[in-house]
Protein backbone atom coordinates (compact mmCIF):
# COMPACT_ATOMS: atom_id res chain seq x y z
CA UNK A 1 0.00 0.00 0.00
CA UNK A 2 0.97 3.64 -0.30
CA UNK A 3 2.12 5.79 2.60
CA UNK A 4 -0.07 8.58 3.93
CA UNK A 5 1.60 11.81 2.74
CA UNK A 6 -0.28 14.30 4.88
CA UNK A 7 -2.83 14.41 7.66
CA UNK A 8 -6.56 14.20 6.97
CA UNK A 9 -8.67 17.35 7.13
CA UNK A 10 -9.21 18.55 10.72
CA UNK A 11 -6.26 16.52 12.00
CA UNK A 12 -3.11 18.18 13.34
CA UNK A 13 0.36 17.06 12.29
CA UNK A 14 3.19 16.75 14.80
CA UNK A 15 6.45 14.82 14.48
CA UNK A 16 5.24 12.47 11.72
CA UNK A 17 1.94 11.72 13.46
CA UNK A 18 -1.56 13.07 12.95
CA UNK A 19 -3.85 13.91 15.87
CA UNK A 20 -7.57 14.49 16.13
CA UNK A 21 -8.99 16.13 19.23
CA UNK A 22 -12.60 15.43 20.13
CA UNK A 23 -14.94 18.12 21.46
CA UNK A 24 -17.50 15.72 22.87
CA UNK A 25 -17.27 12.88 25.36
CA UNK A 26 -17.44 9.11 25.08
CA UNK A 27 -16.69 6.09 27.26
CA UNK A 28 -13.16 4.76 26.73
CA UNK A 29 -14.25 1.75 24.65
CA UNK A 30 -16.39 3.94 22.39
CA UNK A 31 -13.54 6.41 21.97
CA UNK A 32 -11.19 3.52 21.20
CA UNK A 33 -13.61 2.22 18.57
CA UNK A 34 -14.06 5.70 17.06
CA UNK A 35 -10.30 5.98 16.49
CA UNK A 36 -10.08 2.48 15.02
CA UNK A 37 -12.84 3.31 12.52
CA UNK A 38 -10.67 6.27 11.47
CA UNK A 39 -7.75 3.88 10.87
CA UNK A 40 -6.12 5.36 14.00
CA UNK A 41 -5.79 4.63 17.70
CA UNK A 42 -6.24 6.48 20.96
CA UNK A 43 -3.17 8.64 21.55
CA UNK A 44 -0.03 6.89 22.78
CA UNK A 45 2.30 9.25 24.63
CA UNK A 46 5.92 8.23 24.11
CA UNK A 47 7.91 11.36 24.95
CA UNK A 48 8.14 14.63 26.86
CA UNK A 49 7.48 16.56 23.64
CA UNK A 50 4.39 14.56 22.72
CA UNK A 51 2.99 15.06 26.23
CA UNK A 52 3.49 18.80 25.93
CA UNK A 53 1.97 18.93 22.44
CA UNK A 54 -1.16 17.02 23.44
CA UNK A 55 -1.48 18.93 26.71
CA UNK A 56 -1.46 22.23 24.80
CA UNK A 57 -4.23 21.11 22.47
CA UNK A 58 -6.59 19.55 25.01
CA UNK A 59 -6.30 22.24 27.68
CA UNK A 60 -7.40 21.57 31.28
CA UNK A 61 -9.98 18.92 30.39
CA UNK A 62 -10.20 15.22 31.29
CA UNK A 63 -9.28 13.37 28.10
CA UNK A 64 -8.83 9.67 27.35
CA UNK A 65 -5.57 8.25 26.03
CA UNK A 66 -4.74 4.81 24.67
CA UNK A 67 -3.60 3.28 27.95
CA UNK A 68 -5.54 0.73 30.00
CA UNK A 69 -5.14 -2.21 32.38
CA UNK A 70 -8.45 -3.97 31.71
CA UNK A 71 -6.65 -7.31 31.29
CA UNK A 72 -4.21 -6.96 34.18
CA UNK A 73 -1.00 -5.02 33.40
CA UNK A 74 -1.02 -1.51 31.93
CA UNK A 75 -0.90 -1.62 28.14
CA UNK A 76 -0.70 0.91 25.33
CA UNK A 77 -3.19 0.21 22.55
CA UNK A 78 -0.51 0.19 19.83
CA UNK A 79 1.76 -2.25 21.67
CA UNK A 80 4.30 0.33 22.88
CA UNK A 81 6.00 -1.08 25.96
CA UNK A 82 4.54 0.47 29.08
CA UNK A 83 7.21 -0.46 31.60
CA UNK A 84 10.12 1.15 29.76
CA UNK A 85 8.17 4.04 28.25
CA UNK A 86 7.26 7.59 29.21
CA UNK A 87 4.92 7.96 32.17
CA UNK A 88 3.30 11.04 33.67
CA UNK A 89 0.99 9.85 36.46
CA UNK A 90 -0.29 12.19 39.11
CA UNK A 91 1.13 11.51 42.59
CA UNK A 92 -0.52 8.45 44.18
CA UNK A 93 -1.81 7.31 40.79
CA UNK A 94 -2.75 4.90 39.34
CA UNK A 95 -4.69 3.64 42.35
CA UNK A 96 -7.43 1.42 40.87
CA UNK A 97 -9.90 3.10 43.22
CA UNK A 98 -13.05 1.15 44.07
CA UNK A 99 -14.72 3.82 46.17
CA UNK A 100 -16.66 5.45 43.32
CA UNK A 101 -19.52 2.97 43.76
CA UNK A 102 -19.84 2.27 40.04
CA UNK A 103 -18.59 -1.27 40.29
CA UNK A 104 -15.07 -2.49 39.71
CA UNK A 105 -11.94 -0.38 39.90
CA UNK A 106 -10.33 2.09 37.47
CA UNK A 107 -8.85 0.58 34.34
CA UNK A 108 -8.48 3.43 31.83
CA UNK A 109 -6.03 6.31 31.80
CA UNK A 110 -6.80 9.93 31.04
CA UNK A 111 -5.12 13.33 31.04
CA UNK A 112 -6.27 15.43 34.00
CA UNK A 113 -6.66 19.20 34.15
CA UNK A 114 -2.91 19.74 34.63
CA UNK A 115 -1.88 17.22 31.97
CA UNK A 116 -0.75 14.51 34.37
CA UNK A 117 -2.41 11.12 34.16
CA UNK A 118 -5.03 9.41 36.31
CA UNK A 119 -6.79 6.07 36.11
CA UNK A 120 -10.57 6.23 36.09
CA UNK A 121 -13.73 4.26 35.44
CA UNK A 122 -13.72 3.43 31.74
CA UNK A 123 -17.41 4.30 31.36
CA UNK A 124 -16.93 8.00 32.10
CA UNK A 125 -17.75 10.18 29.08
CA UNK A 126 -14.45 12.02 28.60
CA UNK A 127 -13.05 13.68 25.52
CA UNK A 128 -10.44 11.71 23.60
CA UNK A 129 -7.54 12.07 21.17
CA UNK A 130 -6.93 9.87 18.13
CA UNK A 131 -3.47 9.40 16.66
CA UNK A 132 -2.22 7.85 13.43
CA UNK A 133 1.29 7.71 12.04
CA UNK A 134 2.04 9.48 8.78
CA UNK A 135 4.33 6.70 7.58
CA UNK A 136 1.70 4.05 8.27
CA UNK A 137 0.78 2.23 5.06
CA UNK A 138 -2.78 2.97 4.01
CA UNK A 139 -5.22 0.13 3.45
CA UNK A 140 -5.83 1.01 -0.20
CA UNK A 141 -4.76 -1.68 -2.66
CA UNK A 142 -1.78 -0.73 -4.86
CA UNK A 143 -2.53 0.65 -8.32
CA UNK A 144 -1.88 -1.92 -11.06
Amino acid sequence: GSERACCPVNWVEHERSCYWFSRSGKAWADADNYCRLEDAHLVVVTSWEEQKFVQHHIGPVNTWMGLHDQNGPWKWVDGTDYETGFKNWRPEQPDDWYGHGLGGGEDCAHFTDDGRWNDDVCQRPYRWVCETELDKASQEPPLL
Epitope: W48, E49, Q51, K52, F53, H56, F86, K87, N88, W89, P91, D114, G115
Partner: antibody, heavy 118, light 107 residues
Amino acid sequence: QVQLVESGGGVVQPGRSLRLSCAASGFTFSSFGMHWVRQAPGKGLEWVAIIWHDGSNKYYADSVKGRFTISRDNSNNTLYLQMSSLRAEDTAVYYCARDLSMGGMDVWGQGTTVTVSS
Amino acid sequence: DIQMTQSPSSLSASVGDRVTIACRASQNIISYLNWYQQKPGKAPKFLIYTASSLQSGVPSRFSGSGSGTDFTLTISSLQPEDFAIYYCQQTYSTPLTFGGGTKVEIK
Protein backbone atom coordinates in the same frame (compact mmCIF):
# COMPACT_ATOMS: atom_id res chain seq x y z
CA GLN B 1 8.03 27.28 54.96
CA VAL B 2 9.02 25.63 51.69
CA GLN B 3 12.77 25.15 51.65
CA LEU B 4 15.50 23.40 49.69
CA VAL B 5 19.01 23.11 51.09
CA GLU B 6 21.90 21.78 48.99
CA SER B 7 25.07 20.23 50.41
CA GLY B 8 28.03 18.15 49.31
CA GLY B 9 29.91 20.67 47.22
CA GLY B 10 33.64 21.19 47.47
CA VAL B 11 36.95 21.04 45.63
CA VAL B 12 37.62 17.84 43.70
CA GLN B 13 40.23 16.71 41.20
CA PRO B 14 39.37 16.03 37.55
CA GLY B 15 38.17 12.48 37.00
CA ARG B 16 36.95 12.06 40.56
CA SER B 17 33.40 11.76 41.87
CA LEU B 18 31.15 13.78 44.15
CA ARG B 19 27.61 13.40 45.42
CA LEU B 20 25.38 16.40 46.01
CA SER B 21 22.32 16.29 48.26
CA CYS B 22 19.26 18.49 48.47
CA ALA B 23 17.12 18.34 51.60
CA ALA B 24 13.51 19.39 51.11
CA SER B 25 11.09 20.62 53.76
CA GLY B 26 7.78 22.45 54.06
CA PHE B 27 6.03 20.59 51.24
CA THR B 28 5.10 17.05 50.18
CA PHE B 29 8.37 16.12 48.51
CA SER B 30 7.02 12.88 47.02
CA SER B 31 4.44 14.84 44.98
CA PHE B 32 6.92 16.95 43.01
CA GLY B 33 9.48 16.40 40.30
CA MET B 34 12.90 17.89 41.05
CA HIS B 35 15.70 19.47 39.02
CA TRP B 36 19.38 20.19 39.24
CA VAL B 37 20.54 23.40 37.55
CA ARG B 38 24.07 24.79 37.52
CA GLN B 39 25.75 28.12 36.95
CA ALA B 40 29.43 28.41 36.08
CA PRO B 41 31.25 31.45 37.50
CA GLY B 42 30.11 34.59 35.71
CA LYS B 43 27.91 32.59 33.31
CA GLY B 44 24.23 31.89 32.78
CA LEU B 45 21.98 29.07 33.96
CA GLU B 46 22.38 25.55 32.61
CA TRP B 47 19.82 22.85 33.26
CA VAL B 48 21.40 19.55 34.37
CA ALA B 49 18.69 16.98 35.07
CA ILE B 50 15.12 16.28 36.17
CA ILE B 51 13.55 13.35 38.01
CA TRP B 52 9.80 12.67 38.26
CA HIS B 53 8.07 12.64 41.66
CA ASP B 54 8.10 8.84 41.65
CA GLY B 55 11.38 8.41 39.79
CA SER B 56 9.56 7.05 36.71
CA ASN B 57 11.31 9.43 34.30
CA LYS B 58 14.77 10.98 34.34
CA TYR B 59 16.24 13.35 31.77
CA TYR B 60 19.74 14.80 31.48
CA ALA B 61 21.59 17.54 29.65
CA ASP B 62 23.84 16.18 26.91
CA SER B 63 26.89 17.61 28.69
CA VAL B 64 26.41 15.34 31.73
CA LYS B 65 24.69 12.28 30.22
CA GLY B 66 26.48 9.10 31.21
CA ARG B 67 28.48 10.87 33.94
CA PHE B 68 25.83 12.25 36.29
CA THR B 69 22.93 10.38 37.89
CA ILE B 70 19.91 12.02 39.48
CA SER B 71 18.06 10.08 42.18
CA ARG B 72 15.79 10.66 45.13
CA ASP B 73 14.77 9.17 48.46
CA ASN B 74 11.15 10.13 49.09
CA SER B 75 11.19 8.60 52.55
CA ASN B 76 13.93 11.02 53.57
CA ASN B 77 12.80 14.00 51.45
CA THR B 78 16.16 14.13 49.73
CA LEU B 79 17.31 14.63 46.14
CA TYR B 80 20.76 13.53 44.97
CA LEU B 81 23.15 14.18 42.12
CA GLN B 82 25.92 11.62 41.75
CA MET B 83 28.67 13.18 39.65
CA SER B 84 31.52 11.08 38.23
CA SER B 85 34.37 11.64 35.77
CA LEU B 86 34.30 15.29 36.75
CA ARG B 87 35.83 17.89 34.42
CA ALA B 88 37.00 21.45 34.87
CA GLU B 89 33.92 22.62 32.95
CA ASP B 90 31.68 21.10 35.65
CA THR B 91 32.86 23.84 38.03
CA ALA B 92 29.73 25.73 39.02
CA VAL B 93 27.18 26.54 41.68
CA TYR B 94 24.67 23.69 41.68
CA TYR B 95 21.06 24.46 42.56
CA CYS B 96 18.24 22.05 43.22
CA ALA B 97 14.79 23.28 42.26
CA ARG B 98 11.21 22.03 42.56
CA ASP B 99 9.45 21.24 39.31
CA LEU B 100 6.23 22.92 38.26
CA SER B 101 4.45 21.17 35.37
CA MET B 102 7.32 19.48 33.54
CA GLY B 103 10.03 22.08 33.38
CA GLY B 104 9.18 25.16 35.39
CA MET B 105 11.13 25.68 38.61
CA ASP B 106 9.17 27.47 41.28
CA VAL B 107 11.32 26.90 44.38
CA TRP B 108 15.13 27.00 44.46
CA GLY B 109 17.80 26.16 46.98
CA GLN B 110 20.64 28.54 47.83
CA GLY B 111 23.17 26.49 45.85
CA THR B 112 26.33 24.52 46.63
CA THR B 113 29.67 25.21 44.93
CA VAL B 114 31.60 22.51 43.10
CA THR B 115 35.15 23.28 41.98
CA VAL B 116 36.96 20.80 39.76
CA SER B 117 40.66 21.56 39.81
CA SER B 118 43.96 19.76 40.03
CA ASP C 1 18.44 21.01 21.05
CA ILE C 2 16.36 24.19 21.13
CA GLN C 3 18.44 27.35 21.34
CA MET C 4 17.09 30.33 23.26
CA THR C 5 18.37 33.77 22.30
CA GLN C 6 17.73 36.82 24.45
CA SER C 7 18.08 40.43 23.44
CA PRO C 8 19.47 42.75 24.43
CA SER C 9 22.19 41.10 26.53
CA SER C 10 22.16 44.17 28.75
CA LEU C 11 20.26 47.42 29.04
CA SER C 12 20.35 50.57 31.15
CA ALA C 13 17.12 52.05 32.43
CA SER C 14 15.79 54.39 35.07
CA VAL C 15 13.25 53.82 37.82
CA GLY C 16 9.79 54.21 36.32
CA ASP C 17 10.85 53.18 32.82
CA ARG C 18 9.01 50.59 30.79
CA VAL C 19 11.42 47.77 29.99
CA THR C 20 11.03 45.06 27.37
CA ILE C 21 13.20 41.97 26.99
CA ALA C 22 12.92 39.65 23.98
CA CYS C 23 13.48 35.91 23.83
CA ARG C 24 13.55 33.89 20.63
CA ALA C 25 13.43 30.09 20.32
CA SER C 26 15.17 28.27 17.48
CA GLN C 27 11.94 26.33 16.82
CA ASN C 28 8.28 26.45 17.78
CA ILE C 29 7.84 25.92 21.52
CA ILE C 30 4.11 26.75 21.53
CA SER C 31 3.75 28.65 24.83
CA TYR C 32 6.15 26.62 26.97
CA LEU C 33 8.30 29.55 28.01
CA ASN C 34 9.22 30.67 31.53
CA TRP C 35 10.96 33.77 32.89
CA TYR C 36 13.28 34.03 35.92
CA GLN C 37 14.93 36.88 37.76
CA GLN C 38 18.33 36.52 39.41
CA LYS C 39 20.16 38.94 41.65
CA PRO C 40 23.91 38.72 42.38
CA GLY C 41 24.82 35.86 44.70
CA LYS C 42 21.21 34.66 44.91
CA ALA C 43 19.22 31.81 43.43
CA PRO C 44 16.90 32.57 40.51
CA LYS C 45 13.30 33.54 41.21
CA PHE C 46 10.38 32.20 39.17
CA LEU C 47 8.40 35.03 37.55
CA ILE C 48 6.24 33.83 34.67
CA TYR C 49 5.22 30.43 33.31
CA THR C 50 3.67 29.29 30.02
CA ALA C 51 4.61 32.61 28.45
CA SER C 52 2.08 34.83 30.22
CA SER C 53 0.97 33.40 33.57
CA LEU C 54 2.24 35.35 36.57
CA GLN C 55 3.63 33.23 39.38
CA SER C 56 1.95 33.78 42.74
CA GLY C 57 3.48 36.68 44.66
CA VAL C 58 5.09 38.32 41.63
CA PRO C 59 4.17 42.02 41.21
CA SER C 60 1.70 42.80 38.44
CA ARG C 61 4.15 45.20 36.78
CA PHE C 62 5.72 42.05 35.29
CA SER C 63 4.00 40.56 32.28
CA GLY C 64 4.84 38.09 29.55
CA SER C 65 3.56 37.56 26.04
CA GLY C 66 4.24 35.64 22.86
CA SER C 67 3.89 32.18 21.40
CA GLY C 68 5.65 30.01 18.87
CA THR C 69 9.18 31.35 18.66
CA ASP C 70 8.99 34.97 19.85
CA PHE C 71 8.37 36.01 23.43
CA THR C 72 8.58 39.16 25.51
CA LEU C 73 8.98 40.04 29.17
CA THR C 74 7.75 43.52 30.07
CA ILE C 75 8.26 45.48 33.27
CA SER C 76 5.72 48.28 33.07
CA SER C 77 7.35 50.60 35.59
CA LEU C 78 10.84 49.63 36.68
CA GLN C 79 11.41 49.63 40.45
CA PRO C 80 14.76 49.74 42.30
CA GLU C 81 14.45 46.07 43.27
CA ASP C 82 14.02 45.04 39.62
CA PHE C 83 17.65 45.63 38.67
CA ALA C 84 18.84 42.07 38.04
CA ILE C 85 19.51 39.50 35.33
CA TYR C 86 16.49 37.97 33.58
CA TYR C 87 16.48 34.54 31.94
CA CYS C 88 13.97 32.87 29.64
CA GLN C 89 13.66 29.08 29.58
CA GLN C 90 11.87 26.68 27.25
CA THR C 91 10.16 23.59 28.64
CA TYR C 92 8.71 22.21 25.42
CA SER C 93 11.56 19.81 24.78
CA THR C 94 14.45 18.16 26.59
CA PRO C 95 17.14 19.14 27.16
CA LEU C 96 15.55 22.16 28.81
CA THR C 97 17.41 25.30 27.77
CA PHE C 98 17.82 28.83 29.08
CA GLY C 99 18.53 32.05 27.26
CA GLY C 100 21.86 33.75 27.88
CA GLY C 101 20.31 36.34 30.16
CA THR C 102 19.57 40.06 30.02
CA LYS C 103 21.19 42.31 32.61
CA VAL C 104 19.02 45.26 33.60
CA GLU C 105 21.26 48.00 35.01
CA ILE C 106 20.65 51.42 36.51
CA LYS C 107 21.11 54.30 34.08
